[in-house]
């Protein structure tokens, strides 16, 4: 006895695809909600870096800036900033004028 009537395989396929589509649409709408809740990046009081150490600037409640400093100091183990290509150097705040990445201190 056949497990299902003719065409049941394609029905299953269709419902599977529909399920995937629903899942993706749900994810997409989640992302859109998330995106609209994100505030634009706040400008810094300075156009170039003022911190010697690695810095992560995050926005707290009501837009207050919180600074999380990851200083490379012995005897702590140095932590690589993902994909920064700036191991053990002083890094400027990433801003429109300083550009991405590291600045090595110039010596005159």
């Amino acid at each position: 006895h056949p497990l299902g009537s003719p065409g049941s395989a394609s029905d299953l396929e269709t419902s599977g695809l529909q399920e995937q589509r629903n899942h993706l649409q749900g994810k997409l709408s989640e992302l859109q909600v998330e995106q609209t809740s994100l505030e634009p990046l706040q400008e810094s009081p300075h156009p170039t870096g003022v911190w010697k150490s690695r810095e992560v600037a995050t926005e707290g409640i009501r837009g207050h800036r919180k600074m999380v400093l990851y200083t490379l100091r012995a005897p702590r183990s140095p932590k690589m900033v993902q994909g920064s290509g700036c191991f053990g150097r002083k890094m400027d705040r990433i801003s429109s004028s300083s550009g991405l990445g590291c600045k090595v201190l110039r010596r005159h």
Epitope: H46, V50, W51, S96
Partner: antibody, heavy 119, light 106 residues
Framework: QVRLQESGPSLVKPSQTLSLTCTVS????????VTWVRQAPGKAPEWLST???????FYNPTLKARLSITKDSTKSQFSLSVSSVTSEDTAMYYC?????????????WGRGLLVTVSS | YELTQPTSVSVALEQTAEITCQGD??????VAWYQQKPGQAPMKLIY???ERPSGILDRFSGSSSGKIATLIISGARTEDEADYYC??????????FGSGTRLTVL
Amino acid sequence: QVRLQESGPSLVKPSQTLSLTCTVSGFSLIGEYVTWVRQAPGKAPEWLSTMASGGTIFYNPTLKARLSITKDSTKSQFSLSVSSVTSEDTAMYYCVRSSVSPGDDRDVWGRGLLVTVSS
Amino acid sequence: YELTQPTSVSVALEQTAEITCQGDLLDDAYVAWYQQKPGQAPMKLIYKDSERPSGILDRFSGSSSGKIATLIISGARTEDEADYYCLSVDSSEYSVFGSGTRLTVL
């Protein structure tokens, strides 16, 4: 040649609002950081306010309620107003091209304007 | 947030003067140094702890270790008599000037 010139009253009465203007030449205010700094007689300079290149304004938290900074790029001017002044606001007021940062060398200061608050 | 400097420093002519600046964030934040002569606006001598803007004499140098930054003036001259201020930032990145040091060249 880059130049900044402060202008405004040299004498203001207590409780009044002090309004100062900085007129710049030799550069455009568009895309620039501009700052107001003051220095009371015999004291250290004090950062008052910075307008970032994108228009965000930062104020000294202890004075924030009394300060206002505006920029008119078409007139090459930026202004500072200080409300409810007292004798403590007697100082030399400087406008500066830059954010007055420890991280760069771009400062250009005006000559300053001495403002006295007295009745 | 405060940056503490000695009120005054004296140095003999042609000798080396050192002016210190102490602050809790100075191991993480850069320091700049300004010279101010009577009737003039402050002029930046050093930024990023030890960098010199163009046009500043190499007699002026800077260093930083831990929570103390130092301005070094080698071969001091009479024209170096002035007030010197350090500058750094607080945790919100707002600029803060030091209390100031009067340099006397003997």
